[in-house]
């Protein structure tokens, strides 16, 4: 279970929010859905 | 194109466990998050958690920490919600559903059909 | 956890009138010029529908008439000319932080 907020997981690339999962290394994952770069 | 197959409506005792299936088809499993959220009779929507079918991770509900686990099974595209010590409260329909992010250029919403647990 | 309230909790609106429901937040969901705020549309028997995102965004094949507008913890959507249709259950959604949370919902009739 990953506990985690998203707001607080925002850095800004190119002028794109991308939010890294604390699982997770890079941007490649699973789409969370409903936010903005969201992977999983 | 698209579908989120859900199993069949459940009759469970207070106390017992129940384990709902997701079946996802028409897209590369693993790119989208599955969310769950549920809906007692007559009443609103309260989301569960979601499972990342890509990394297995997941997050819950504060709500149901300890009674709720979301697994997956990449070689049959099925995503599982389990609840435990079911009661009478828990009766609901249980939906899973993918979305997309903002940033795609579309947003779409997939929801399956819907899986009617009754605890009594 | 953020809590979303919503109004009215029903609404009666004639055929062709505009309809307005409320929601607000108990606190900001925007983060960076960013609203996180959606709408689902739920009709009996069936799962909800993605209507609005990002607060002001149009879901894919959602009609003109629904609108969405808003910023901060205050929110509305629009039903800008109710039809037979549209007869539903209105949430809205907040996708700022988890755990995602919903409105009570508001049901729309016709008078």
């Known amino acids: 279970d990953a506990e985690f907020r998203h707001d607080s997981g925002y850095e800004v690339h190119h002028q794109k929010l991308v939010f890294f999962a604390e699982d997770v290394g890079s941007n490649k994952g699973a789409i969370i859905g409903l936010m903005v770069g969201g992977v999983v | 194109q698209v579908q989120l197959v859900q199993s069949g409506a459940e009759v469970k005792k207070p106390g017992a466990s129940v384990k709902v299936s997701c079946k996802a088809s028409?897209?590369?499993?693993?790119?989208?998050?599955i969310h769950w959220v549920r809906q007692a009779p007559g009443q609103g929507l309260e989301w569960m958690g979601f499972t990342s079918p890509y990394s297995g991770v997941s997050n819950y509900n504060q709500k149901f920490k300890g009674r709720v686990t979301m697994t997956r099974d990449t070689s049959t595209s099925t995503v599982y919600m389990e609840l435990s010590s079911l009661r009478s409260e828990d009766t609901a329909v249980y939906y899973c559903?993918?979305?997309?992010?903002?940033?795609?250029?579309?947003?779409?919403?997939?929801w399956g059909q819907g899986t009617l647990v009754t605890v009594s | 956890d953020i809590v979303m309230t919503q109004s009215p909790d029903s609404l009666a609106v004639s055929l062709g009138e505009r309809a307005t429901i409320n929601c607000r937040a108990s606190e900001s969901v925007d983060n960076d010029r960013i609203s996180f705020l959606n709408w689902y549309q739920q009709k009996p028997g069936q799962p909800p529908k993605l209507l609005i995102y990002?607060?002001?965004k149009q879901g894919t094949g959602v009609p003109d008439r629904f609108s969405g507008s808003g910023s901060g913890t205050d929110f509305t959507l629009t039903i800008s000319s109710l039809q037979a249709e549209d007869v539903a259950v209105y949430y809205c959604q907040q996708s700022k932080e988890f755990p995602w949370s919903f409105g009570g919902g508001t049901k729309v009739e016709i008078k």
């Open positions: 559903a993918r979305f997309d992010n903002y940033d795609r250029g579309y947003v779409r919403d997939y």
């Open positions: 990002a607060a002001t």
């Open positions: 028409g897209y590369t499993f693993t790119t989208y998050a």
